[in-house]
Interface confidence: low
């Protein structure tokens, strides 16, 4: 499995998606686990509903949620209020009995908030204002591979 990188901004939410063959994994529950070291075990963080038919219901463990679109074949994990310690290697898994198939290996990267936690204001173009104002930040955008609402640089 190749590792897919998902980048999020500290303090915001990050959404990780794991596509899979819905027929091949029909009837199987899914899980999200954190890889402990390169060769170590994958420690379960959260798994989908015990009843497969209710997999679409979002289940939380702390700030991590999981939901499964079993028809479309997409497992979605949401990491809320992303923090530097959330960075690391994870796996999306398909469970069958005591076994687990890896659907996707995921590297979560946590980027510093360019606004340094100042209040979000508006972004100005030259001529609109003489002074710099903070860029607007959406605090609930989640994307992979730089696909987040990254605050725009300051302008004068």
């Amino acid at each position: 499995h190749n590792t897919t990188v998902f980048q999020g901004v500290a303090g915001q939410s990050l959404q990780v998606s794991c596509p899979y063959d819905s027929m091949k994994h029909w009837g199987r529950r899914k899980a999200w686990c954190r890889q402990l070291g390169e060769k170590g075990p994958c420690q379960r963080v959260v798994s989908t509903h015990n009843l497969w038919l209710l997999s679409f219901l979002r289940r939380w463990n702390g700030s991590t949620a999981i939901t499964d679109d079993t028809l479309g074949g997409t497992l979605t994990i949401t990491l809320r209020n992303l923090q530097p310690h959330d960075a690391g290697l994870y796996q999306c898994q398909s469970l069958h009995g005591s076994e687990a198939d890896t659907l996707r290996k995921v590297l979560v990267e946590v980027l510093a908030d360019p606004l340094d936690h100042r209040d979000a204001g508006d972004l100005w173009f030259p001529g609109e204002s003489e002074s710099f104002e903070d860029a607007h930040v959406e605090h609930s955008i989640s994307r992979s591979l730089l696909e987040g609402e990254i605050p725009f640089p300051p302008t004068s």
Epitope: P114, G148, T155
Partner: antibody, heavy 118, light 112 residues
């Protein structure tokens, strides 16, 4: 996979108009600032225009060299960015790239060539 | 407008050897947030530019670690620790501090 595909380039006479399009896919279009950057034949890169995202009201900004002649817009229902170019001059001849903005121009289209000549 | 000046304009390199490109801005790109709004791009022959480095020293996703950026508020350097054949092309620095965003003239890197 993020993809940007430009179209609409071609040959136009000085003083004429042209509209470029850029179709985006693989990302949530409304969340992002989008921009146009151009490159004259054999020359370097020049930033042309930017349009902000939904959170910032889709406001536009322009390089002084094109302000008043070019208009950037977006149709979010079609995930498409536009550049309406009026009163074209010979010095506007360039490959026009659309690019997505995050920390910089992180994804670029393949470019579309605009030639202004009589 | 902020003027970006690159040196050299042409850089013949030997695969496996290091290479360095300089960029100077007419105004400090260091903002009070502590971020330096300087980016580096590579435009390979016949291709669109690609983002290499942002915030002066942070590698963009997927960029090999042989590329590194450094500098102060007005003087910046892009270093390639060991040049590979695929690194040929034109390198541009760009200021992202204020409008209009401006690029350097470009440095053409080619194999000797």
């Amino acid at each position: 996979e993020v993809q940007l595909v430009e179209s609409g380039g071609g040959l136009v006479q000085p003083g004429g108009s042209l509209r470029l399009s850029c179709a985006g896919s693989g990302f949530t279009f409304t969340d992002f600032y989008m921009s146009w950057v151009r490159q004259a034949p054999g020359k370097g890169l020049e930033w042309v225009s930017v349009i902000r995202n939904k959170a910032n009201g889709y406001t536009a900004g322009y390089n002084p060299s094109v302000k008043g002649r070019f208009t950037i817009s977006r149709d979010n229902s079609k995930n498409t960015l536009y550049l309406q170019m009026n009163s074209l001059r010979a010095e506007d001849t360039a490959v026009y790239y659309c690019a997505r903005l995050t920390y910089g121009f992180d994804y670029w289209g393949q470019g579309t060539l605009v030639t202004v000549s009589s | 407008d902020i003027v970006m000046t690159q040196t050299p304009l042409s850089l013949p390199v030997t695969p496996g050897e290091p290479a360095s490109i300089s960029c100077q801005s007419s105004k400090s790109l260091l903002h009070s947030t502590g971020k330096t709004y300087l980016n580096w791009y590579l435009q390979k022959p016949g291709q669109s530019p690609q983002l290499l480095i942002y915030w002066m020293s942070t590698r963009a996703s997927g960029v090999p670690d042989r590329f590194s950026g450094s500098g102060s508020g007005t003087d910046f350097t892009l270093k390639i620790s060991r040049v590979e054949a695929e690194d040929v092309g034109v390198y541009y620095c760009q200021q992202f501090l204020e409008y209009p965003f401006t690029f350097g003239q470009g440095t053409k890197v080619e194999i000797k």
